[in-house]
């Protein structure tokens, strides 16, 4: 069966910086991932990016950067310039679209407990979209 | 006909600030992002950055960020784009354009807005 | 930030030849480019979008290929109103970055 999964991980040097990991387990190729915060995509969620593994990608703040880093693996850099750090109680969703298997989203925060540079253990919630 | 219909040219001094506009028709607003890209006399494009006229959401070359603004207006289906402390690095001809979310390109630009800074 | 490189700024060709315009990219960019023609004192108009896919209405003239890091626009059967200037575009990552475009003179 695929997997989603998420990491947070709080940058050490910079409380305000964040980063996403969302990787998918499974076969198949996968057509686009989709990277929300606040809650699933369409669901609640507000859109932080759109991957396309050939395509390239789009962004809306407070992404800073997004990029591929594997062919089943994305990572999201996020930058809040305020003195507060919003990110820190924030559910993080990631779904990927893949063929033939559908899509599957996963959603991840940072817990309370985690120092700075420590990234949370993968946290799937799989949620199966028949698209 | 699908067209992005600029505002026209400005003459502004060193230090003020300028809000162009971009108005849409022929076409679901909503269903597209605007970008806006840059083009210095004689010289090559940079891209700005771009607005989701649905949430607002925007994203922004950091070269730019602090120098433009970019919001929508949904009812009168316009992007805006304000630039802040000008100086004369800001003098171009500037034009927003439409990105089709689905193919990922820009498929149809505006007329342009040439903005001079000079005092 | 990615450097898209086109090494040609001018080039000159008479109507009816065929000249093909690159374009490199610093790094992979897949298939995430689009071509992009400038006509003197106009907007400009998109004629090929990731790599090698026509823009509507564009003439079977212009065609687009490449990937990974090397791209190319290659132009046949040249008509005086390819006069242009014609740039590259990727959007890979952010931000998205043009190539410095290359002066298409048509004797």
């Known amino acids: 069966t695929p997997e989603v999964w998420v990491q947070v991980q709080m940058e050490a040097t910079e409380l305000s910086s964040f980063t996403v990991h969302c990787g998918f387990l499974g076969p198949g190729s996968i057509s686009l991932v989709t990277v929300s915060w606040g809650g699933p995509d369409g669901a609640g969620g507000t859109k932080l990016a759109v991957l396309h593994p050939e395509l390239g990608t789009r962004q809306w703040a407070p992404a800073r950067q997004a990029r591929w880093e594997t062919q089943s693996s994305i990572s999201l850099a996020l930058e809040d310039s305020g003195a507060s750090s919003p990110f820190a109680n924030t559910t993080f969703c990631c779904k990927f679209a893949s063929f033939p298997e559908g899509s599957w989203e996963s959603c991840g925060s940072l817990p309370p407990s985690s120092d700075p540079g420590l990234s949370a253990p993968p946290t799937p919630v799989p949620i199966l979209r028949a698209d | 006909e699908v067209q992005l219909q600029q505002s026209g040219p400005e003459l502004v001094k060193p230090g003020s600030s300028v809000k162009i506009s971009c108005e849409a028709s022929?076409?679901?607003?909503?269903?597209?992002?605007v970008d806006w890209v840059k083009q210095s006399h004689g010289k090559s494009l940079e891209w700005i950055g771009a607005?989701?006229?649905?949430?607002?959401?925007?994203s922004y070359n950091q070269k730019f960020e602090g120098k433009a603004t970019l919001t929508v207006d949904k009812s009168s289906t316009t992007a805006y784009m304000e630039l802040r402390s000008l100086t004369s690095e800001d003098s171009a001809v500037y034009y927003c354009?439409?990105?089709?979310?689905?193919?990922?390109?820009?498929?149809?630009w505006g007329t342009g807005t040439t903005v001079t800074v000079s005092s | 930030d990615i450097v898209m490189t086109q090494s040609q700024k001018f080039m000159s060709t008479s109507v009816g030849d065929r000249v093909s315009i690159t374009c490199k990219a610093s790094?992979?960019?897949?298939?995430?480019v689009d071509w992009y023609q400038q006509k003197p004192g106009q907007s400009p108009k998109t004629l090929i979008h990731s790599a090698s896919n026509r823009h509507t209405g564009v003439p079977d003239r212009f065609t687009g290929s490449g990937s990974g890091t090397d791209f190319t626009l290659t132009i046949s059967n040249i008509q005086s109103e390819d006069l242009a200037d014609y740039f590259c575009?990727?959007?890979?990552?952010?931000?998205?970055?043009f190539g410095g475009g290359t002066k298409l003179e048509v004797k």
């Open positions: 022929g076409f679901t607003f909503a269903d597209y992002n």
């Open positions: 790094q992979n960019v897949r298939s995430a």
């Open positions: 607005i989701n006229p649905n949430d607002g959401g925007t």
């Open positions: 354009a439409r990105w089709v979310n689905n193919d990922w390109y820009f498929d149809v």
């Open positions: 575009l990727q959007h890979w990552n952010y931000p998205y970055t």
